[in-house]
């Protein structure tokens, strides 16, 4: 299921007074589409040009990040007269056209959404022929991509003084809460790190002393599941085995 | 409510620096792009520079390129302009403006301002 | 380089319709935006677009724009509209000019 935010609160544009007679370059993206990792998600994306009834050859373009400079995900080409846009890249094949850029449309399908897809997506387009035109979307539309919880890595790590402690990271969107629960322990929330920049999907809870043999199992949820994966500590002669 | 508050302006000697700073309130400030625009004393507006969301991307106008860097904190809200080298024909009036998704200057700070003088 | 033009001055009577315009290649391509700048204060988004109005803009206050040129109009002009009136435009990238200003004075 594909959300698209047609409209935010800190719009402060509403009122048009009259139609102009001549197109101007402008493109228009929502400012957000929402999707579930695994899924598919299309990002709208129209234009408007003053290049009445315009039939050269055309590139159409979507970058991700940045505007201008960002990285290109997906281009295609079509030639003088043709509505058939011939796919130049498509990262991974996870990018196909669904609009018709000699319609002013270039909307992009997404497949099997990562949440590494999660970011700003810039639309372009380019006229090549006896018009040498081109312009691109600055404000991009943002695709938010939501995921139940995983966990990505549990373990036991040596601590100062003999002890040990436990680590546990998990991924999701919303970034998921996790909770330890283990001997003598109950449901303990730990230390929970932040997720870091550049890993905004990343949670992080440590369990700084483990006192007790025994399992301790770490749980992430948030509002689209939950994870729970465990980990084992035995002491003998000072030393520890860990099994997941 | 949406507001833009600049700081930083002030007296400041031929080839001297400055740096100032614009805090943003009321909106979420990692969404738009940013930009200053300046204006001298009894003169026009002049567009100065634009960052985009992440600051990844700037872009400077002529007269203030290689001299001034335009940046943003978008932890702390903040978009900042260092200014170096600074020249007499750098005073003036410098407001930060949110840039809204219809190519314009959708909310504006009161301004701070600048003077270059020996 | 891109230049808009903008008469420097344009006087109206009160209650009558003040005409500002604003020349230049970029509007064949590109929208105009006007902003409005009392003394002592920072501008103010008055109409973007061409044609379309800010909420909280009375609605006195419309734009066009026809080949290479802008139009801002004011209907009914108040006493509270003296100003100067700036246009501008972007470009396809990071250009961004304005216009050199109308200082509109109700007589």
């Known amino acids: 299921f594909v959300r698209t935010k047609i409209d935010t609160t800190e719009n402060l544009l509403n009122t048009e007074v009259h139609s102009s007679p001549a197109q101007r370059w402008s493109m228009q993206v929502p400012p957000e589409v929402s999707a579930e990792a695994g899924d598919a998600a299309v990002l709208p994306c129209t234009f408007t040009h003053p290049h009445r009834h315009y039939d050269g050859p055309l590139t159409a373009i979507w970058r991700a990040g940045e505007p201008y400079a960002g990285p290109q995900v997906f281009r295609c080409a079509a030639a003088r007269g043709s509505e058939l846009c011939q796919t130049a890249l498509s990262l991974h094949g996870r990018f196909r056209l669904l609009g018709n850029p000699r319609r002013n449309d270039l909307s992009l399908r997404v497949e099997r959404l990562a949440l590494a897809d999660d970011r700003r997506y810039f639309c372009r387009v380019e006229f090549a022929g006896d018009v040498h035109d081109r312009y691109e979307s600055r404000h991009g539309v943002r695709l938010h991509v939501t995921a139940a919880p995983r966990i990505v890595n549990i373990s036991v790590l040596p601590s100062p003084a003999h002890a040990f402690r436990a680590l546990c990271t998990a991924e999701g969107e919303p970034p998921p809460a996790l909770a330890w629960s283990g001997p003598a322990l109950g449901n303990s929330l730990a230390a929970v790190r932040s997720p870091r920049e550049g890993h905004g999907h990343l949670v992080t809870a440590e369990l700084p002393a483990l006192t007790h043999d025994g399992r301790y199992t770490c749980t992430a949820a948030n509002s689209l599941g939950r994870s729970e994966a465990s980990v084992y500590l035995f002491r003998f002669h000072g030393a520890s085995g860990a099994s997941t | 409510q949406v507001q833009l508050v600049e700081s930083g302006g002030g007296l400041v000697q031929p080839g001297g620096s400055l740096r100032l700073s614009c805090a943003a309130s009321g909106f979420t400030f990692s969404n738009y792009w940013m930009t200053w625009v300046r204006q001298a004393p009894g003169k026009g507006l002049e567009w100065v520079s634009f960052?985009?969301?992440?600051?990844?991307?700037?872009y400077y106008a002529d007269s203030v390129k290689g001299r001034f860097t335009i940046s943003r904190d978008n932890s702390k809200n903040t978009l900042y302009l260092q200014m170096n080298s600074l020249r007499a024909e750098d005073t003036a009036v410098y407001y930060c403006a949110r840039e809204g998704t219809s190519s314009m200057f959708d909310v504006w700070g009161q301004g701070t301002l600048v003077t270059v003088s020996s | 380089d891109i230049e808009l033009t903008q008469p420097p001055s344009v006087s109206v009577a009160p209650g009558q319709t003040a005409r500002i315009s604003c020349s230049g290649d970029?509007?064949?391509?590109?929208?105009a935006s006007w902003y409005q700048q009392k003394p002592g204060q920072a501008p103010v988004l008055v109409i973007y677009?061409?044609?379309k109005r800010p909420s909280g803009i009375p609605e006195r206050f419309s734009g066009s724009n026809s080949g290479n040129t802008a139009t801002l109009t004011i209907s009914g002009t108040q006493a509270e509209d003296e100003a100067d009136y700036y246009c501008a435009s972007f470009t396809y990238m990071s250009d961004f000019v304005f216009g050199g200003g109308t200082k509109l004075t109700v007589l």
């Open positions: 960052i985009s969301y992440s600051g990844s991307t700037t």
């Open positions: 970029a509007l064949r391509s590109y929208y």
């Open positions: 677009d061409d044609n």
